[in-house]
Structure formats: C-alpha cells, structure tokens
C-alpha cells in the first residue's frame, strides 16, 4: 500500500475517540510499555507518547477492568461483569473456541479389526448447559490449551455417576509434565479445582467406558469451566441474555428468575406477560401451551379430626400451561372426602386422627397398640402400606435430567394404597424418593454371625406403567456415601416384589429414582408414565415399630423374666422359652430361630460350622461303593485360586476378560474369594477405602481391562459379582437342588473315577437371573496335575457360563484323587530263597489315588525252603 505525502488536507491531532491503548509484549525483565494505537492508521497524528506499563503479572480483581488511560483498575458498570484474570465457559451450545474433542480406539487387535467399529464419532458432545462424555469403549478426550500470564487455577463442576466409565482430568504444562498421576482420577460428582503454572497449559478431560455387559453407561457431564491467570482484561463483558448485573463491580451475572427475561447487558430482568412464561435464565418469554390432563396430578390431604381425607388436584410445578386457552383443561374440583386409610402397622390412630408409633414393647396392625406377651419381643421395622402422608423418615425431590440440579419439587405423591411419581418439570427429570434408616437392630434372640452377613432386609412391591423408555432405579447408600444403584427396571413392569439384603449395620438411605425418558429434551409428553410403590417393608430397624411379636429366649432376673440371646446355634423352644442346640449337620435359619424346624439340614458332603450358621465342606469327602469307601482330602485346594477367561473385544475393540477367584473348602466356611472394583478405588481419597465396592464370596467374577490397554499402572478391574455365597452340597451326581453341572461341558474323564462336584448358590437375584446365580466346581482326579492343579472353563462357553446365570468350572488335580488305601496297591510275595522271603508292595497302575496310606516298605521274613520240608 502506498502513502502519498504532501497531498490532501493536513492530518489533525488524534482525538481520544480515535485511538486506544495497548501493551507491548513483555521483555525478559518482565516490563512492558503502554502505547497508543489509532483505530484507523493514517487518519490523525500526535498520539500520546509511550509510557511505562504495569508489570507483566499485574491484574485486576474479578469485577474490575484495567482502565488503560490511567492504568488503574475500575469497577465494571452495571449490566457488565469481568472475571479479572479469568475466562469462564458456561454455554455449551457448541464447542467453545479453543476446545478440541478427540477420540481414539484403546486397543484394537489386528485380527479383529474388521469387526471393530471406528471411534471417530465418539466425542464429548455439547448439550447446552454442559458437555457430555462418550458412553462407548472409545477414549474421548476434551482438550483446552491456555497460556497463563501468571499462575492460576482451573475449576469445573462435573457429574460422574457411573463407575463403568473411567474419568480422568490432567494438565500438561510447558515442560510436557502431566500433573501427579494419582490425582488425575476423578472422585464422584463434585467440583474439581486444580492449580496451573504460568505459561502454556493443556487441560485434558478423558473418558473411557467399558460396559461389557451391553449396559449403556451414564455419561460424565462437565460444566462451568473457569480458568484464572489468563491476562488482564481491559474491558468488562456485557451480561449475556437471560442474566443481569444490578450492581457495579460484578464478577458474574445472575440468572433471571423463572417468568422473567433479559436482553444482553441488562441491569435487571423484565417480567413476562401473563400469557407467557420463561425458565430460569431466559432471554425470551414463550407462549403458554394449553393445559392438558398431563399438567396436573392428585394427592391426599392429611387426615382431619373426623378421620377423613380430601382428594386434592394440583398443577405440576412449574406451571407453564395456560388453562384459559381454548381447548385447555381446568383443574378438577378438589375436596371430595373419603375415609382415611388405617395407620401403617406398628402405628396407632390418635384422637385427632394422626398416626403415632407404638411404644417399644408393643405392636399393632395399624389400629391400637398391644403389649407383646411374655416370652416374646417386638419384631421392629417399618412396614409402609398406607400412604396418606409421607412417613417422617422419607422425603421426595426432583433432580433435573438436563442440568442435574435439584428442583425443590415433590417427586412422589401419596395416593392412599400407593405412592406414585408426580408430574415433573420435564420428562427426563429424576423423580426421587428416599427412605433413611438410622441403623439396624437384629433380634435379641439372634447372635451376630460373621459369615451370614444379613443384618436386615428391605422388600418393596412396585409397578411401572410406561409408553416409552422409562427407568426405575433402586439405590442404596451407606453412612451418607454416594448411592450405589442396586437394580434398574426398564419399561413397563407388572406389580412385583423385590427384596434386598442389608449386610452392614450402618445408617442406610434407600432411594428410588424414576425417569420417564432418558432423551435429552425438555417438555411433558409422557406424564402418564408412572412408577407406583405399594408397600415398603424394612426389618430390624433401630427405633422401628412392630406389627407382631416373636418368641424369644427368657432369662430370669430380679424383675421377672426378660428376653435374651440364645447361644450361637441354639433355637428357641416356643413353649418354654428355653434354648436348645441345633443337631449336628444342621444350621439355624437366620433371624427365625423358633422351634426345632428352624434347624435346617446341611446338604450332602457338608457339615455345620461351629456356630451352626452355615454349611461348609471341611475339605474331606467320602464316596461309598459296594466294594469299598473312597475318602478324599482336598486340603491342598483350600486356598484361593484365580483364573482368567479368554480375552474378548467389544464392538469398539476394547480388550477385556473375565477374571474368576475361587475358594473351595475349609476355613470353617469363611468366604475367601475377593473381587474388587478398582475403578472406584482410583476415585477414593486416602482413608475412605470403605467406599470401594468389593465382593467377598466362595466364587466371584470381575471384568479386567489389562494394563497394556488402559496404560495405567495396574489393569482396571470393574463390576465385581458374587457367583457363590452358599454351598448347597458336594456330590458325584450331576444335579443337586435344581443346580445342574452338565458333564458334557468339559472333556470326558477317562480314569473311571467320578468327578466330585461342589454346588454353590449366590444370593444375588437379578432380573436376568430370577433364581439367582449358581456355580458348580467339578473336581477331577488327575495324577499328572500336581496340587493345586489346573482350573478350566467350559470350552464352548469361555466366560464360565453359557447363560449368564449358571457358572461351571473344572478343577483337575492330583489332590482331587481319593486317598490311597490298601485297595490301591498289589502285594507280591517272593519265593523262599536261601531262607529269606520278600513281600513287596506296588501301586496299581494307573495310580489313581493320592495321600492316604503310604506304600508299605518291603518286608523280609525268614522262611524254610521246600527242600527243608522234603528232608
């Protein structure tokens, strides 16, 4: 471009409006200059001289900007804000400038590459208020590179509900050093806060799901990423539409409340017209749709003094519909009175028709309290089957399915003989019902038992009626820790009962969460989709009430007789209240020690432990045949053994395998196999390992993603499952109590010695395994396999199971052979030679025994030869 001098009008001195100030780059001493720069070069002359600038690390506080005119910090005007040295990302309609989302396959074996779908589309997805991770087995990385002028911080909020996703956050700085390895593992949902060094920093949010049982994982959600230390700001930013800043010096703009709106840079929000509405943080108001019957719900009032309740109709909150529009429905008239249902069992009706708990030592069916007769104790718990008001230890709320904030709404409404999910603000809201139990108190008459861990149980009857993809989650949380999902029901489920066993005496919260649809869209289309709970029964609750009394063992004292615990393994004689030891080879039914019939016989090949709480095998077994008795000793197999299934690959090429741990016998029946979820472990702060999900059983299974795949120090193990909690029996039969150990699953035995099968059951009842899981361990005598021998999985079902519910193992070992006895060797007597006769012993071939008696030494006896006798 060409500059022509001396032609045209003379340049005028620049006015303030025609130039702005900038800083030069920092020099090596950390200094810089403030220089004036014209908006349009060549328009004017006589710019102010450069002056020394503030030091390079100088910055203003949040709510201020650097006024370059006098290089001082000034407060932002109303309707504007500044982060001082920061930037914030709180809108995720699209990936903000500077962010990158990458994806990669973790480990794709060449041999399976044809079946591997590629990962190019598995990325973090912006979803308005937040950004959501992938949910498949690809690794998706969200990256942001930033240059900090001074040390700063990054903080962000995240929602991380699902341990079948590995979620890590780490930073690489100028020296390419990642942040400390052990801090990169994200804990459960909270706010993340990491310090950043001056200079270049690359922030990484990385997720990998590995849901290998075709369960779709819940994505990690990240929002409100704020980074400080970026640079000074020489201007304040106008509040975005839907927000406002009423005061000078605002570090952020506040959201407009519901039914208000604002434009860009506003100092206040404006109310919507009466026929319009808006959600919190809106830039416009929307017209109200006509009300439909989906916009209201019904509930019952508390009982009045006359023992009557009113049916009440209420608009779902927030009420966004217009009832005055043509075609709109109006709220049906409330006030129809009906008789109140009875009180719940263990409660009684007061004079003013409220329900109060019966005092300890008494029981009720919901009407009057009756003292427990002598020789009995109250069976304390909570049985809720009438729903006129929400019990005092239950609460309900609504969690937004869009931004995962609690809405302060009622999620479930009482309806007489059931409680049901109310209308949410949106169909993907989680309608949450929580029952908190302070602790448990097993009956006086039952002694604690280390192996039979049942402390209490919760049983509830429910149904779901759904037109689309609704989900009902049942979750359990111990001692205020994060709820762990125990079971999920999808779609319509007929009225049914579900029981969960509590194995730890702790404060427990039980949570039911119902989501009408998992789709990420607002609106009420499916409000007729509903979950109903008819009854909830929790046993052995500390501070609970009783609906009946049970017999107890009596103990004489100065004040008469009182209930006491029977010694371990003793049942209570109902008539006399005395304790009697269960017979040998029987165990006592947990929490029901009444009468001789409470002693349940052990299965074949098992015996009771010392306290008659479980049947176990003491590593011995006897097999009778017409010709002899075969005795076995499996002590060499008493330790825990592990076995990995063959590697598998998910559709995205993630390599994983099932890992099994087994403990067979001995140890007084103590379960020795432990499987741990170390994804959760990696998320746990030191000293809180109690949160880690581990399973202890006779046989357990875990999914392993090997270390070479994940690139972490150890492989990742996840989703531990118990496959065997109870030994049903030991037998040479193929079937025992409905458990089948098909012999054809393994190569045939050839020795003629029948396999000995251990039959186990698991307590875990799931929808897919309605009878629970079972496990069989087939012990096969193989003299060639030194103890402990080798474990195999079925050749055609390499994950140990052909149906997901029944697991089978073959254990070949010399230790599985019968103990050697005199029947297992030959005796050879030599002829008399030189007055000596030798008796030699040799094992029969093939030798199919182990241990037991040793082969006798050769015996030498004096004999007289035949010619002596002839003489």
């Amino acid at each position: 471009f060409q500059v022509t001098l001396g032609t045209g009008p003379e340049l005028h001195a620049c006015k303030e409006s025609e130039y702005h100030f900038e800083y030069t780059a920092c020099d090596s001493t950390g200094s810089r200059w403030r220089v004036a720069v014209p908006h349009s070069p060549g328009l004017c002359t006589s710019l102010p001289d450069p002056v020394k600038g503030t030091e390079c690390s100088f910055s203003c506080n949040a709510g201020e900007f650097l006024d370059m005119k006098d290089q001082s910090c000034k407060p932002c005007a109303e309707g504007r804000y500044s982060l001082g040295t920061g930037i914030r990302f709180d809108e995720w309609d699209e990936l903000p400038h500077g962010f990158a989302s990458l994806s990669a396959n973790l480990e794709v074996d060449d041999s399976i590459s044809e079946s591997t779908e590629n990962c190019t589309s598995s990325k973090w997805v912006p979803r308005g208020d937040y950004i959501a991770s992938n949910t498949d087995e690809c690794t998706a990385t969200l990256m942001y590179a930033v240059n900090l002028k001074q040390s700063g911080t990054v903080n962000f909020e995240y929602y991380y509900p699902d341990s079948s996703i590995i979620f890590e956050f780490f930073v690489q700085n100028d020296q390419c050093q990642p942040s400390a390895d052990d801090s990169r593992w994200m804990k459960t949902t909270e706010k993340g806060w990491v310090e950043l060094n001056r200079g270049n920093n690359v922030l990484y949010w990385r997720t990998t799901a590995f849901s290998v049982w075709s369960k779709v994982s819940k994505p990690v959600l990240v929002r409100n990423i704020a980074i400080t230390g970026v640079a000074y700001t020489s201007e304040c930013f106008p509040c975005k539409p839907g927000t406002y800043a009423a005061k000078q010096g605002s570090p952020f703009c506040k959201l407009c409340p519901a039914n208000y709106y604002s434009n860009k840079g506003e100092t206040s929000c404006h109310p919507c017209d009466a026929d319009k509405y808006s959600e919190k943080g809106s830039s416009t108001c929307k017209v109200r749709p006509a009300c439909t019957d989906k916009d209201y719900f019904y509930t019952h009032t508390a009982c009045d003094a006359q023992g009557e309740t009113q049916l009440m109709y209420k608009w779902a909150i927030p009420k966004i519909c217009g009832e005055d529009l043509e075609g709109a429905v109006k709220l049906p008239a409330s006030g129809v009175k009906t008789r109140c249902p009875p009180c719940n069992p263990g409660f009684f009706k007061t004079d003013n028709s409220t329900c109060e708990p019966c005092p300890y030592g008494s029981y009720s069916n919901g009407s009057d309290c009756t003292h427990c007769p002598a020789g009995t104790e109250p069976a304390v718990g909570f049985e809720y089957k009438w729903w006129n008001t929400l019990p005092s230890n239950m609460e309900t709320t609504v969690l937004s399915g869009i931004n995962f904030e609690y809405k302060g709404l009622t999620g479930w409404e009482v309806a007489g003989d059931h409680i049901y999910t109310a209308v949410g603000a949106s169909d993907n809201d989680f309608m949450i019902l929580t029952l908190v139990v302070p602790g448990f108190r097993p009956p006086q008459s039952v002694v604690a038992d280390t192996e039979n861990k049942e402390v209490a149980r919760i049983t509830f009857v429910f149904e779901t009626i759904c037109s689309v993809n609704c989900e009902l989650y049942f979750m359990v949380g111990m001692n205020s820790r994060t709820n762990t999902p125990v079971e999920t029901w999808k779609g319509t489920k007929g009225k049914q009962s579900y029981t969960y066993t509590i194995e730890e005496n702790a404060t427990v919260s039980f949570t039911w969460a119902f989501q009408r649809t998992t789709l990420h869209e607002t609106g009420r289309k499916y409000t007729n989709d509903v979950a109903k709970i008819y009854s909830i029964n929790v046993t052995n609750v500390m501070g609970g009430v009783a609906s009946y009394c049970r017999p107890c063992a009596l103990e004489a004292s100065d004040l008469g007789s009182s209930c006491t615990s029977c010694p371990a393994g003793h049942y209570i004689n109902r008539d006399s209240g005395t304790c009697h030891l269960c017979p040998s080879n029987t165990i006592l039914k947990a929490h029901q020690p009444y009468g001789a019939q409470a002693c349940v016989p052990c299965g074949p090949g098992t015996k009771n432990n010392k306290i008659h709480s479980l049947c176990y095998n003491d590593c011995t077994f006897s097999r009778n045949t017409p010709s002899r008795i075969f005795n076995y000793n499996f002590s060499a197999l008493a330790g825990t053994v592990s076995l990995a299934g063959v590697p598998s690959f998910t559709s995205k090429g993630l390599k994983y395998f099932h890992h099994f741990t087994l403990s067979l016998c001995g140890n007084q029946g103590k379960k020795m196999a432990v499987c741990t979820d170390n994804v959760t472990d990696l998320r746990i702060p030191d000293g809180e390992a109690g949160f880690s999900k581990s399973v202890t059983a006779y046989v357990c299974q875990v999914v392993i993603i090997p270390s070479e795949v994940m690139g972490y120090k150890a492989g990742v193990s996840s989703q531990p499952v118990s496959l065997a909690d109870r030994l049903v029996g030991v037998s040479t039969d193929m079937t025992l109590e409905g458990i089948v150990s098909p012999v054809e699953l393994f190569h045939p035995e050839t020795s003629g010695i029948p396999d000995i099968v251990f039959f186990f059951r698991s307590n875990d009842v799931t929808q897919s395994c309605s009878s629970g899981r079972s496990t069989t361990i087939r012990l096969r005598c193989n003299p060639m396999k030194a103890a402990p021998g080798t474990l195999r999985l079925p050749s055609m079902c390499s994950d140990g199971t052909c149906d997901g519910c029944n697991f089978h193992f073959l254990w070949e070992s010399v230790a599985a052979c019968p103990l050697c006895s005199a029947s297992d060797y030959h005796t050879f007597v030599s002829s008399c030679v030189a007055g000596i006769q030798k008796t030699t012993y040799m094992w029969r071939e093939p030798k199919l025994c182990s241990g037991g008696i040793s082969l006798p030494e050769q015996r030498v006896t004096i004999c007289k030869t035949i010619d002596f006798w002839l003489k």
Partner: antibody
C-alpha cells in the same frame, strides 16, 4: 395498534368453495390463538373455528367439521379459512378474531352469501 | 356445550336512563382455582364489528367508560349501563370462555325510545 383485515368475501353457489384470509399486524401473530366467528343476518354471533399457535391445535364447530379448514402462516401473519361444500346456512358475515381466551380484537368482517 | 341465554332480546331506553342486561349460563363459569368468572361482554354497534367491553365478568377493558359495569358470579351475570348515551346504542353480547367451544348469548338490542 392491533389490526385485523379480512379479504373480500363474495357471492358463491352451494357446493362451491371459498377461501377467506385475514392479515394481522400490530402484535406478534405467532403468540396468539386465532379464530373465525360468524354472524348470520339479524342473528347472534357464532364461533366457527380456532387455530392454536401453530397447526398442532385446531377446533371446529360441529356443523362445519370436514368442510372448513383453518390455517395460519406465522411468517406472513395471515390467518385463512378454506370453506368447501358451502351451504345456504353458511351465509353470514365472517370475522377473524384474536383469541387469547376471550375474543379481544376483531376484524371488520366480510360478507359471504351462499345462494343459487 | 355451555348454553348462554340473554334477556331481554331488545330494550328501548331514553338517554340518561340506567339499563340492565342479563345473561345466564347453563353451567357455572366460576373457577375456584383462580376465583374468576369466565365471562366477557361485547358491544356491536350497527354496521361494525364487535368490541370487547368487559372480561372476567367485571373487569373493564382500557378505554371503556366507567358507566359500563359488569357483575354476577357462577351462572347469573349482569351488564349495567348507567346514564345511557346515544353512542351506547348497539347490540350487547355475553360470551363464556370457561369451556370449549366458546359460546355467545343471543344478543340484546339497545334502542332509543
């Protein structure tokens, strides 16, 4: 200022068709339900049809169901009434009206005469 | 459908008089949820289109003279015009908007004696 201006009506034979239109101005058209109301000579007012914010809600009086179709073009702020199989009893002055709940603004009306 | 019955069908008055027009609905127009009556009054001068006078049974629209007073609740409603003026000569219609379809009364013709 809110204005509703109907197109010219006319004389039509029984069994024939006619389309009425109504141009709206002075308000955000898409924010309102709209209706057609008619008045036969020397008779009272009679609601004919309503349309919601968009085509997802329409409603008709029983005697015109299947013969009349109400529609709207929110981009052009135009309300229409397509009248087919006209009968002599459809003879009336037709008004378009803004309809938040009650009818708060009315057009000047257009006369439709159905006669052989 | 809700049937609206107006009486009288016509009325001759002198300027300055007070007139009362009645409207009866076949079912209650009172909605307990918001304590409102869903009734409007419209005025239709000769050769003109109807004009909204009163909503919610008693709320005057802006610009409507205060000599027009709506009253009543449930099923019985009244429009009172005190000190009738010559420009008030018109047909007066009541209309319910409680339910769909919206229905009108037969109209009351106000004439000068």
């Amino acid at each position: 200022e809110v204005q509703l201006v109907e197109s010219d009506g006319g004389f039509v034979q029984p069994g024939r068709s006619l389309t009425l239109s109504c141009a709206a101005s002075g308000f955000t058209f898409s924010d309102y339900y709209m209706s057609w109301v008619r008045q036969a000579p020397t008779k009272g007012l009679e609601w004919v049809a309503t349309i919601g914010y968009d085509v997802s809600y329409t409603n008709y009086r029983d005697s015109v169901k299947g013969r009349f179709t109400i529609s709207r073009d929110n981009a052009k702020s135009i309300l229409s009434l397509q009248m087919d199989s006209l009968r002599s009893e459809d003879t009336a002055t037709y008004y378009c009206a803004r309809h938040p709940s009650y009818f708060d603004y009315w057009g000047q009306g257009v006369m439709v005469t159905v006669s052989s | 459908d809700i049937v609206m019955t107006q009486s009288p069908s016509s009325l001759a008055v002198s300027a300055g008089e007070t007139v009362t027009i009645n409207c009866k609905s076949s079912q209650s127009l009172f909605y307990s949820e918001n304590q409102k009556n869903y009734l409007a009054w419209l005025q239709q001068k000769p050769g003109q289109s109807p004009k909204l006078l009163i909503t919610w049974a008693s709320t005057r629209q802006s610009g409507v003279p205060d000599r027009f007073i709506g009253s009543g609740s449930g099923t019985d409603f009244t429009l009172t015009i005190s000190s009738v003026q010559a420009e008030d000569l018109a047909i007066y219609h009541c209309q319910q908007y409680y339910d769909t379809p919206r229905t009108f009364g037969g109209g009351t013709q106000l004439e000068l004696k």
